[in-house]
Interface confidence: medium
Amino acid sequence: DGPAGSWEQLIQERRSHEVNPAAHLTGANSSLTGSGGPLLWETQLGLAFLRGLSYHDGALVVTKAGYYYIYSKVQLGGVGCPLGLASTITHGLYKRTPRYPEELELLVSQQSPCGRATSSSRVWWDSSFLGGVVHLEAGEEVVVRVLDERLVRLRDGTRSYFGAFMV
């Protein structure tokens, strides 16, 4: 265990000090705003945390450029279909960048969940999960949008969530 061993030890110690950015945000009663904006998230309580990423008005803000696995799950459910429901529900992760005026689609899914209601039971459940690796620059933001957000069920922070970690 000569110089090479102590060099490896030094590298290991340095790596342990370089915290890999990661965040897991959870659904809360305040998530649904009705304003047409992105979903808002709990950042501290329960399972939620931020490490090496920041949060602002529903957005995860990247402080360190790199490749990130970003993900979001939303639990959908209801009794019958809400008035005014579009034929499909869109759940998406979108990027905001200072270099472009509009949000950019990163990952998007669509479904028509209300069809799961039956004549014998108007209660229905569905969910949507998105996840993928994208490159993000420092200062760029990622948000979650659901149209129609009225279908999102929040309950206890385990059903609807949003997160990212550097890979």
Epitope: L32, G34, S35, G77, L83, G84, R155
Partner: antibody, heavy 121, light 111 residues
């Protein structure tokens, strides 16, 4: 603050139609359902139906389907309820009410002042 | 349609005493841990006013002497200490499915 202001009282003959308006202010009109509820003199409350101003989608109590027409004008933030083929038992106060944002719990958190519609020959 | 039956039809309570109104639904109005039952107060010549939503949530600006409880098919509105201004008709309403229906109303008076 949220306000719903309804049109004035109407007197109509049997067989005629009536159109009641409900002008909304103080909130995003296209994000909340507008419900219509009526109350006959000395009686309880009866739900007629609702309109979603965002796209004009409607839901009706089967009892009123075919006679009631609910619409909304986004440009003026006004909802309308038209009731046709009026009969004496339609004499009532008609209320518009804002439905809660969360569709699975359609409670009515703000109400108009009511419009008395009298049907009499 | 879901039928809501309130009891009693009328209630006379002394000032400062507790008033309790019951509402029974013809089927469960529960979904995902919430009960879709709401309560309104209506005074003569006025529109109804929301008091309690989803069974137990107090609407903002409503005095905390009003409370709601229950689940499934059985619900209760309680006024813990009746005040003169509480004289009104009280209605339960289900928002579980349309057509949304109301109870027949309970008239609360001062004894």
């Amino acid at each position: 603050q949220v306000q719903l202001v309804q049109s004035g009282a109407e007197v109509k003959k049997p067989g005629a139609s009536v159109k009641v308006s409900c002008k909304a202010s103080g909130y995003t009109f296209t994000s909340y359902n507008v419900h219509w509820v009526r109350q006959a003199p000395g009686q309880g409350l009866e739900w007629i139906g609702a309109v979603y101003p965002g796209n004009g989608d409607t839901s009706y109590n089967q009892k009123f389907k075919g006679r009631a027409t609910l619409t909304a004008d986004k440009s003026t933030s006004t909802a309308y309820m038209e009731l046709s083929s009026l009969r004496s038992e339609d004499t009532a106060v008609y209320y518009c009410a804002r439905g809660s944002y969360y569709y699975t719990s359609s409670y009515f958190d703000h109400w108009g002042q009511g419009t008395l519609v009298t049907v009499s020959s | 349609d879901i039928v809501l039956t309130q009891s009693p039809d009328s209630l006379a309570v002394s000032l400062g005493e507790r008033a309790t109104i019951n509402c029974k639904a013809s089927q469960s109005v529960d979904f995902d841990g919430d009960s879709y039952m709401n309560w309104y107060q209506q005074k003569p010549g006025q529109p109804p006013k929301l008091l309690i939503y989803t069974a137990s949530n107090l609407e903002s600006g409503i005095p905390d002497r009003f409370s709601g409880s229950g689940s499934g098919t059985d619900f209760t509105l309680t006024i813990s200490s009746l005040q003169a201004e509480d004289v009104a008709v009280y209605y339960c309403q289900q928002s579980y499915e349309d057509p949304f229906t109301f109870g027949q109303g309970t008239k609360v008076e001062i004894k």
